[in-house]
Interface confidence: low
């Protein structure tokens, strides 16, 4: 399927609107500090060039690869050295090394100001004045803050963003209509970004075998009526799509994703009965719908797994003949029978099964050796079941904020070297598992909770890789993708940690605390809590609770005072002294 001009091929396949959007996303994800106008200029130049290639595929430079074309364009940015430092050295390299270099410089935590939401009337005016620019600005701002955001999915978010403004800017109460929609898009967007970051980490750090195993398990849960060969085909195609997007090949990724959606809709009968309503939708919506589709019903008459994978005398023969196919089939068969298990648990079970076969197929009596393999799965299954049960009980008892605080303390004690902002961000997100998963029926709790925790812990791993400070974090993040969560769960208080010296500055608060939103107030308090634990890692729950209760009372008192700043100046040092005494 070779084309004389790759850029013309993609422009024709995707259409101008999607082509321009994806190029803007690609450039914004690579050059995250560049101003919006600079990116728009580059995109327009690339688009005009693509059009000349559509008109004549033999025109000059039209035969160049997309990496060459895009890389050459990025390297024309005048301020590359001043803005990006050593990233400018990428431009001295040839493809494919130049693109690899750009990828390595993507920053998961760019030093960009938080997005401030203007007044609704201001946003509506901007939307009506220049809708195209308004939507491009959205793509740019999200892409530069989330350099691994799944690009075709970001186009879908932009379409929803546009629809929200088109509807609400005509409404009687614009704010009541628009703000909940924007909140929903923000929260869904952050979740989508984090999920995609795990897919890219899986591919980049553990290889496509790890990603394919994840995909076999997940798709087998979703499509339990599909044949293994059908699931295998979907896995191969999905792996290609995500490899491309994670590698910055956004045009190819979006094109292949559209092809995959087309294939799934043309072959619904052999995939799932749940695809019908997705397949009537327009492209972006259809692809999103297919990705989020609920699990199909399990076939009623599935036989016991034991016959083929334990009792059969041919287990070692089948395993030796084609290891990955046999293990893939085992994973498929197990996953389609267990929508109640997390994908990570299913992968641990497949890993345990593989280890048993490696050992037993070399033994004198292989069948005798692997006969009890399913019994060995029990502790692996019970561990996440118990973890979910205990943490949901704690969540129900404490509520979200205090549950987050419990996790903040737990994780700060485990890995106190990690920066306070990272511990606060990660623990707050870990704490959101309660509201997200604990309300679900028993059969959906574990897949919801553990697979969500894997996404959140990947964020910790990604941030820690940028600035490594803890050998324990490095070990949990790099040794095994499927065992990351159990690895972190198993960490105890770090006895080797030297407590942080007390710094009164850290616990000095001002009247601006009173004007913060509830969420911002929580973050301030939680930041203080982390610092307290870093100062006194062996403080008991009761001691920490006492200090935090005093802190809340002190803030509440001063925010009610006439002269707030004077109150903070007077009461602050008393609070610090009382806290030090309580923790002594």
């Amino acid at each position: 399927d070779t084309h004389k001009s790759e850029v013309a091929h993609r422009f024709k396949d995707l259409g101008e609107e999607h082509f321009k959007g994806l190029v803007l996303v690609a450039f914004s994800q690579y050059l995250q500090q560049c101003p919006f106008e600079e990116h728009v200029k580059l995109v327009n130049e690339v688009t005009e060039f693509a059009k000349t290639c559509v008109a004549d595929e033999s025109a000059e430079n039209c035969d160049k690869s997309l990496h060459t074309l895009f890389g050459d364009k990025l390297c024309t940015v005048a301020t590359l050295r001043e803005t990006y430092g050593e990233m400018a050295d990428c431009c001295a390299k040839q493809e494919p090394e130049r693109n690899e270099c750009f990828l390595q410089h993507k920053d998961d935590n760019p030093n960009l100001p938080p997005l401030v939401r203007p007044e609704v009337d201001v946003m509506c005016t901007a939307f009506h004045d220049n809708e195209a620019t308004f939507l491009k600005k959205y793509l740019y701002e999200v892409a530069r803050r989330h350099p691994y955001f799944y690009a075709p999915e970001l186009l879908f978010f932009a379409a929803r963003y546009k629809a929200a403004f088109a509807e609400c800017c005509q409404a009687a109460d614009k704010a009541a209509c628009l703000l909940p929609k924007l909140d929903e898009l923000r929260d869904e967007g952050k979740a989508s970004s984090a999920k995609q970051r795990l897919k890219c980490a899986s591919l980049q750090k553990f290889g496509d075998r790890a990603f394919k195993a994840w995909a076999v398990a997940r798709l087998s849960q979703k499509f339990p009526k599909a044949e293994f060969a059908e699931v295998s085909k979907l896995v191969t195609d999905l792996t290609k799509v995500h490899t491309e997007c994670c590698h910055g090949d956004l045009l190819e990724c979006a094109d292949d994703r559209a092809d995959l959606a087309k294939y799934m809709c043309e072959n619904q009968d052999s995939i799932s009965s749940k695809l019908k309503e997705c397949c009537d939708k327009p492209l972006l919506e259809k692809s999103h719908c297919l990705a989020e589709v609920e699990n199909d019903e399990m076939p009623a008459d599935l036989p016991s797994l034991a016959a083929d994978y334990v009792e059969s005398k041919d287990v070692c023969k089948n395993y030796a003949e084609a290891k990955d196919v046999f293990l893939g089939m085992f994973l498929y068969e197990y996953a389609r029978r267990h929508p109640d298990y997390s994908v990570m648990l299913l992968l641990r079970l497949a890993k345990a099964y593989e280890a048993t076969l490696e050992k037993c197929c070399a033994a004198a009596d292989p069948h005798e050796c692997y006969a009890k393999v399913f019994d060995e799965f029990q502790p692996l299954v019970e561990e996440p079941q118990n973890l979910v049960k205990q943490n949901c009980e704690l969540f129900e008892q404490l509520g979200e904020y205090k549950f987050q605080n419990a996790l903040l303390v737990r994780y700060t004690k485990k890995v106190p070297q990690v920066s306070t902002p990272t511990l606060v961000e990660v623990s707050r997100n870990l704490g959101k598992v309660g509201a997200k998963c604990c309300k679900l029926p028993e059969a959906k709790r574990m897949p919801c909770a553990e697979d969500y925790l894997s996404v959140v812990l990947n964020r910790l791993c990604v941030l820690h890789e940028k600035t490594p400070v803890s050998e324990k974090v490095t070990k949990c993040c790099t040794e095994s993708l499927v065992n990351r969560r159990p690895c972190f769960s198993a960490l105890e208080l770090d006895e080797a940690y030297v407590p942080k010296a007390f710094n009164a500055e850290t616990f000095t608060f001002h009247a601006d605390m009173c004007t913060l939103s509830e969420k911002e107030k929580q973050v301030k308090k939680q930041t203080a809590l982390v610092e307290l634990v870093k100062h006194k890692p062996k403080a008991t729950k009761e001691q920490l609770k006492g200090v935090m209760d005093n802190f809340a009372a002190f803030v509440e008192k001063c925010c009610k005072a006439d002269d707030k700043e004077a109150c903070f100046a007077e009461e602050g040092p008393k609070f610090v002294a009382a806290s030090q005494a309580a923790l002594a």
Epitope: A226, E227, A229, E230, S232, K233, S270, N318, A322, F326
Partner: nanobody
């Protein structure tokens, strides 16, 4: 690497017979259901027939029911399609696939029914 190689196609007169074979390698053949699919010039792929892993359950599209018979030999890792009472509309490239997929995983073998 999974490989499927079809053979047995050719030119045959209407009412004639052919037997297609599909030799499989690179996977545990005896654990998979298999299908025959065909694609006529200028048309999309059409599922023809399927057989389960053990060979006990066979299925056919309405257009070939009663004329074609699917079978397998797991020891030889080979899938067969016996085609009788062939008609001009059976003219197509025939290829075998794992499971019920209609996605082409092989070159196929050409069957032409013409007088």
């Amino acid at each position: 690497q999974v490989q499927l190689v079809e053979s047995g196609g050719g030119l045959v007169q209407p009412g004639g017979s052919l037997r297609l074979s599909c030799a499989a390698s690179g996977f545990t053949f005896g654990s998979f259901g298999m299908s025959w699919v065909r694609q006529a010039p200028g048309k999309g792929p059409e599922w023809v027939s399927a057989i389960d892993s053990g060979g006990g359950d066979t299925r056919y599209s309405d257009s070939v029911k009663g004329r074609f018979a699917i079978s397998r030999d797991n020891a030889k890792k080979t899938l067969y399609l016996q085609m009788n009472s062939l008609k001009p509309e059976d003219t197509a490239a025939y290829y075998c696939t794992i499971g019920r997929s209609t996605s082409r995983g092989s070159q196929g073998t050409q069957v032409t029914v013409s007088s």
